[in-house]
């Protein structure tokens, strides 16, 4: 080994070196939280970049760059260090127009703490292992969601566009001409029935067990879907999102009530099956796999 490499190895294995890097990262994180940093922080930024560069150079000199089994770039944790340094120099010396987008990558510096703190490294390792093991469960989950999204698509496509429209058409009015003139929420409220405090027109359906319109209103399919158009089963992707919402139980009771009002109470069977299979079974299966992966990593 050359004297330079010997010195690099000595520095690399020294505990003070690890402490220096850890303190640098933590101080860097504190500086990144500043709202309006003063001008002198620019010099501090250069110092941090210098320390990170020095750390990487020490590692490269001690272990080699990329040829060989234990070299710098063969360790995935060093990829992060390398990216941090590359972006530090890119944002500083290369004029790339929208630099603010590249500055976002400075946040990656905080992730360097993972590679420095041994306990944290183990936990993250376990997390990555669990993700690898989750692939089969994820495939099963996506498959199940896709199947139910297709069923939902067939059962409820367009149903959430059903609204209670006022009965009388004046002069030469048509639904189409009215819809073309509607602009503000107030305009909508003139023609459609809204429950007090509701931001969407009252949903209704054409079957006997679905929601009915009050006196003087007719159920029509027109306009956009509820929740600014985000809640629907009109395309596979929207249906998939709705199913994901059911699986994660994210305000699912609202989706359930909206759909049952528009389609009919019979369709509660669909929701019972999805909640039992998606929410109770699949979610717990995912948790079980994660728990197993952690157990294996600990052993």
């Amino acid at each position: 080994f050359s004297p330079l490499r010997r010195i690099s190895i000595k520095i690399l294995v020294h505990s003070l070196f690890s402490m220096l890097i850890m303190c640098t990262i933590l101080t860097n994180c504190i500086f990144m939280t500043m709202n309006n940093p003063p001008d002198w922080t620019k010099n501090v930024e250069y110092t941090f970049t210098g320390i990170y560069t020095f750390e990487s150079l020490v590692k490269i000199l001690a272990r080699g760059f990329c040829v060989g089994e234990f070299t710098f770039l063969r360790d995935p944790w060093n990829w992060l260090d390398f990216v941090v340094i590359v972006f530090a120099y890119l944002t500083e010396f290369v004029n790339l127009g929208n630099v603010s987008a590249l500055r976002t990558f400075r946040v990656l510096r905080a992730l360097k703490t993972i590679s420095v703190i041994p306990g944290l490294k183990t936990i993250v390792g376990a997390l990555i292992q669990s993700v690898k093991k989750l692939s089969d469960v994820m495939i099963l989950t996506v498959f199940c969601l896709s199947v139910f999204a297709l069923i939902g698509l067939q059962l409820f496509m367009g149903n959430l566009k059903h609204k209670c429209f006022r009965n009388s058409l004046e002069n030469n009015e048509t639904l189409e001409s009215i819809m073309n003139t509607l602009e503000s929420e107030e305009d909508f409220r003139k023609y459609f029935y809204y429950l007090e405090g509701s931001k969407d027109a009252l949903l209704c359906g054409f079957s006997t067990d679905s929601g009915q319109c009050p006196e003087g209103y007719t159920c029509v399919k027109i306009g956009r879907n509820p929740d600014y158009g985000y809640t629907s089963f009109d395309t596979f992707s929207w249906a998939f999102l709705a199913l994901f919402r059911l699986m994660t139980q994210d305000y699912w009771e609202n989706l359930y009530q909206q759909t049952l009002r528009a389609a009919g109470k019979t369709y509660m069977i669909f929701f019972v099956v999805v909640i039992f299979l998606g929410s109770f079974y699949l979610i717990n299966l995912i948790l079980a796999v994660v728990a197993m992966a952690y157990e294996e990593q600990n052993q």
Partner: nanobody
């Protein structure tokens, strides 16, 4: 294209009766509302009666108890007019809010209008 065809208009005596019929031709997936409107000379068009698929029926105050709207099938409906008065003289239009197919939004369709004259 969906078309509404009316029949049954004409001349009637005061106190007499007439029956108007309307049929929807062409592709019809779902009729949301069937209605009859009328336009009296020099007046605006007004809703006379309407019926929904779930059986909800409404009438304008001036015809309650005299006129009866009914569904004669999935694509046909009629207006039975009894105890006619000269004020009932108008062009009667058949109207439907319907979806031509399952993917379409509800659209408005009008008949060409049929003249009802009540005169002695």
């Amino acid at each position: 294209e969906v078309q509404l065809v009316e029949s049954g208009g004409g001349l009637a005596q005061p106190g007499g009766s007439l029956r108007l019929s309307c049929a929807a031709s062409g592709p019809v997936f779902n009729i949301n509302k069937m209605a009859w409107y009328r336009r009296a000379p020099g007046k605006q068009r007004e809703l006379v009666a309407s019926v929904t698929p779930t059986g909800s029926i409404s009438y304008t105050d001036s015809v309650k108890g005299r006129f009866t709207i009914s569904r004669d099938g999935s694509k046909r409906w009629s207006l039975q007019m009894n105890s006619l008065t000269p004020e009932d003289t108008a062009v009667y239009y058949c109207n439907a809010l319907l979806q031509p197919d399952s993917y379409s939004n509800t659209r408005t369709y009008w008949g060409q209008g049929t003249l009802v004259t009540v005169s002695s």
